[in-house]
Interface confidence: medium
């Protein structure tokens, strides 16, 4: 789940030794802490967009924010596959792409994201309230799935209202070399915390009670990003009416790499690759969910009719595995 995490606002320090600089050094650790924590959890984002040119044509884009080797992506609609969902496409980096009507074109956009265009006519064409789900298999993080649908009252060509606040994107940060920054930041954070050890701990207060207090925002991954390590997932169900947020029991687990000293996702791709990937809009994705995802015995064949072979755009399993890599 991508929840918008409000980094707790700190009480302004009492006048004296700290002053303005002290205030900044107190806020900085919380921002760094948020980055250090949020960068370590794999997650999936889903973006659904109705094309302006063809009102019944949809583009679904999905991405995986993790550092493992992605080896399989399935896109389904009507819910998770096996829980009423129907497979639209299966993308395998080495063995090809397979798609079923009304899917028109499935393709890899980057080494960690895919897009799927759906035909817009006939009985099988999607309604604006259709839920689309993407599931990624990654070694060593495991299977991760998210679902999304078109935001309510979206204008054609728009995926969701633009996000109103500056966002610290874990994925973009990773692409831009956040690994080094985070390592430095985490070390600096420890240094700051040690420096402040002899001072009384700053009092935390919810940011909503102090609108004047500085706030930092970050996209917080679903698991392992909060202190409790378990956050309920949210399903955004637009169903052609204002979105509702349903919270269910927490599940899902920490990733294989959550315990590493540096949490940054390694994404060996150039600016051109990530620049073409728009920021997933807030209303268009939901949590990593656990459930019945694939029909029993419905594993796609490795070869056969309908299989479009293509060269691996990422190189031979290009993404770096985070643990025990020799």
């Amino acid at each position: 789940m991508r929840t918008e995490a409000q980094v707790p606002a700190l009480q302004p320090p009492e006048p004296g030794l700290e002053g303005a600089m002290g205030h900044r050094t107190l806020v900085l650790p919380w921002v760094l802490l948020t980055l250090c924590v949020t960068a370590g959890t794999p997650e999936v984002w889903v973006q659904v967009r109705m094309e302006a040119t063809e009102l019944s044509s949809f583009t679904i884009r999905c991405g995986f924010l993790g550092s493992g080797s992605i080896s399989l992506v399935t896109v389904s609609w009507g819910g998770p596959n096996g829980a009423g969902g129907t497979t639209l496409a299966v993308l395998h980096p080495e063995r090809g792409i397979r798609q079923w009507a009304p899917a028109r074109q499935a393709r890899w956009e980057t080494q960690s994201s895919i897009s799927l265009i759906l035909e817009g006519s006939g009985a099988s064409s999607p309604c604006a309230n259709t839920t689309f789900c993407c599931k990624f298999a990654s070694f060593p993080e495991g299977s991760w799935e998210a679902c999304g649908s078109l935001p309510p009252s979206s204008d054609p060509g728009l995926s969701a209202p633009p996000t109103p606040a500056p966002i610290l994107r874990a994925d973009l940060a990773g692409i831009l070399g956040v690994s080094g920054v985070l390592l430095f930041g985490c070390v600096y954070l420890l240094h700051l915390l040690r420096r402040h050890k002899h001072r009384p701990a700053p009092r935390l207060q919810p940011s909503r009670t102090s609108p004047q207090a500085p706030r930092a925002r970050a996209w917080a991954p679903s698991q392992a990003s909060q202190a409790a390590l378990h956050v309920p997932y949210a399903t955004i169900n637009t169903s052609c009416r204002p979105a509702t947020l349903d919270t269910a029991h927490p599940h899902g687990g920490p990733s294989w790499w959550a315990s590493l000293p540096t949490h940054a996702a390694h994404r060996p791709q150039g600016p051109a690759a990530w620049a073409s990937t728009p920021i997933p809009a807030r209303g268009s994705f939901v949590s990593v969910e656990n459930g019945l995802y694939a029909q029993a015995g419905e594993r796609p064949p490795h070869t056969g009719p309908g299989l479009t072979l293509f060269p691996d755009p990422r190189g031979p399993r290009a993404m770096e595995g985070p643990l025990g890599v020799r």
């Epitope: 070694f139 060593p140 698991q223 990733s255 294989w256 656990n290 019945l292 594993r299 031979p316 399993r317």
Partner: antibody
Framework: EVMLVESGGDLVKPGGSLKLSCAAS????????MSWVRQTPEKRLEWVAT????????YYLDILKGRFTISRDNAKNTLYLQMSSLRSEDTALYYC?????????????WGQGTSVTVSS | QIVLTQSPAIMSASPGEKVTMTCSAS?????IYWYQQKPGSSPRLLIY???NLASGVPVRFSGSGSGTSYSLTISRMEAEDAATYYC?????????FGAGTKLELK
Amino acid sequence: EVMLVESGGDLVKPGGSLKLSCAASGFTFSSYFMSWVRQTPEKRLEWVATISGGGDKTYYLDILKGRFTISRDNAKNTLYLQMSSLRSEDTALYYCARHEDYAWYAMDYWGQGTSVTVSS
Amino acid sequence: QIVLTQSPAIMSASPGEKVTMTCSASSSVNYIYWYQQKPGSSPRLLIYDTSNLASGVPVRFSGSGSGTSYSLTISRMEAEDAATYYCQQWSSYPLTFGAGTKLELK
């Protein structure tokens, strides 16, 4: 038909070394992650190590890192496990297994196992 | 590491009987995999991603669960189902297995 055949198991003294092999056939070996899993005399299963299809990424059980090395030769369709500084607790039946990514990396095929006994 | 606790350790069932065994994780995991091992044989994949039947597995087997609690059910026990069943997770490092549930024919 997918087949995995392990070999190389033996009786070795503590501190000794051993290299296990797993000959694969019936599938495109280089496309699959492969693992070694061992089964103790008490019948407990313990994951040992995993290697990516291209051999460029390896993953180990922490307590074995440094002593065990997983490798593969895709030209020979063979998976290896080099074990050194062997201890009595390494005594087990060692299986090689294939990770099927269409089954979300479950280990869908296992070999028959090769027995390693570490004893003085 | 995540510890998977299987219960019961040993159970017996008569042919035609419904059998349910559980796998409890020490902390939340995304999915559970189930393997069947008969004496003298290597493990065989039964269920992947909690609820999906592996190729060739009879439909009498089913899996369910989420978070820390998972189960494997055999709707109607058959003689050939007598075996040890292991659950496995790999949402968290390292990949771990449960100690197994031995299912005997009554």
